[in-house]
């Protein structure tokens, strides 16, 4: 299984989308875990709703949010307020009983904003003033179902 490398800027959000065969994994909850060492166990960070039929609802653990679009076959994980300590190897998993099938391996890299680096030395400043617009990249975005639940009549 290939490892996908995703980079995010510290302090911003990084969105990860893991795709899967919708019918093969129908009825299975999904999880996002962090691998401890190259051959170590994968420590669960967050998993989708305990009742599978509500898997499309966002589930949060700390700054990590997960939601599953079971029809499209896409589970989306959002790492909010990315910190240097969030860097590492993760897995998207499909849960069946006590077994976990790896859907995707993801290497998260956190990029530091050079303007926040107090030891950066002298900063070069252009003579003419210029505006700088930082572009925030959302990796593999997917639409989450807009819903108020319980259903409205």
């Amino acid at each position: 299984l290939n490892t996908t490398v995703l980079q995010g800027m510290a302090g911003q959000s990084l969105r990860v989308s893991c795709t899967y065969d919708a019918l093969k994994h129908w009825g299975r909850r999904k999880a996002w875990c962090r691998q401890l060492g190259e051959e170590g166990p994968c420590q669960r960070v967050v998993s989708t709703h305990g009742v599978w039929l509500l898997a499309f609802l966002k589930k949060r653990n700390g700054s990590t949010v997960i939601a599953d679009d079971t029809l499209a076959g896409t589970v989306t994980i959002t790492l909010k307020n990315l910190q240097a300590g969030d860097a590492g190897l993760y897995q998207c998993q499909s849960l069946r009983g006590r077994e976990a099938e790896v859907l995707q391996k993801v290497l998260v890299e956190v990029l530091e904003d050079p303007l926040d680096d107090q030891d950066a030395g002298d900063l070069w400043v252009p003579e003419e003033s210029s505006s700088f617009e930082g572009a925030q990249v959302e990796h593999s975005t997917s639409r989450n179902q807009e819903t108020s639940f319980p259903p409205t009549s």
Partner: antibody
Framework: EVQLLESGGGLVQPGGSLRLSCAAS????????MSWVRQAPGKGLEWVSV????????YYADSVKGRFTISRDNSKNTLYLQMNSLRAEDTAVYYC???????????WGQGTLVTVSS | EIVMTQSPATLSVSPGERATLSCRAS??????LAWYQQKPGQAPRLLIY???TRATGIPARFSGSGSGTEFTLTISSLQSEDFAVYYC?????????FGGGTKVEIK
């Protein structure tokens, strides 16, 4: 208020075709999975087909696979079911239903009757 | 395909009495089960999801219970508007399937 209004039903001969429509209002149509569920006269409910909010994913019951096609026009807030090679056993009231990606049917239309008979 | 079996097929109850409807799945569906109500000439209406959670606007006299393969829908005190056909639906196995229904009629 969520409203789903089916149309297009009627009498058709075996082997014929029919196109059902479902006009939706009262919610953000493009954000929801939509399904067709049918009910033969005096019988129970049978799920027929589903389409994701974007229209990118479609699935069918084995009984209609290859004959029916589900589609949607999000700009018109309308769901469709193109039914070809119709058989007598397709005779039923066809409901369109707004649901979740896990096929929980939150809201239903009033249904449209399709009769396949010679 | 998961087979959902509902019993009894018909239940005769007097207004004000309790009605207990059963639904059995051929395999465990955990709590991924829904109940729908259908009155004559009308579309079905979602009553219960997650085996026990009432949908918005559903009166408290309706309650669902069970997990795995055995489920129950209880109507604590039948009102005239509750006489209808009730269907259960399993969701976690493809394709989603419904039970054959239980008709609750006036005794």
């Amino acid at each position: 208020e969520v409203q789903l209004l089916e149309s297009g039903g009627g009498l058709v001969q075996p082997g014929g075709s029919l196109r059902l429509s479902c006009a939706a209002s009262g919610f953000t149509f493009s954000s929801y999975a939509m399904s067709w569920v049918r009910q033969a006269p005096g019988k129970g409910l049978e799920w027929v087909s589903v389409i994701s909010g974007s229209g990118g994913s479609t699935y069918y019951a084995d009984s209609v696979k290859g004959r029916f096609t589900i589609s949607r026009d999000n700009s018109k807030n309308t769901l469709y079911l193109q039914m070809n090679s119709l058989r007598a056993e397709d005779t039923a009231v066809y409901y369109c239903a707004k649901g979740t990606p896990t096929l929980l049917f939150q809201h239903w239309g009033q249904g449209t009757l399709v009769t396949v008979s010679s | 395909e998961i087979v959902m079996t509902q019993s009894p097929a018909t239940l005769s109850v007097s207004p004000g009495e309790r009605a207990t409807l059963s639904c059995r799945a051929s395999q465990s569906v955990s709590s991924n089960l829904a109940w729908y109500q259908q009155k004559p000439g009308q579309a079905p209406r979602l009553l219960i999801y997650g085996a026990s959670t009432r949908a918005t606007g559903i009166p408290a006299r309706f309650s669902g219970s069970g997990s795995g393969t055995e489920f129950t829908l209880t109507i604590s005190s039948l009102q005239s508007e509750d006489f209808a056909v009730y269907y259960c639906q399993q969701l976690p196995y493809w394709p989603p399937t419904f039970g054959g229904g239980t008709k609750v009629e006036i005794k």
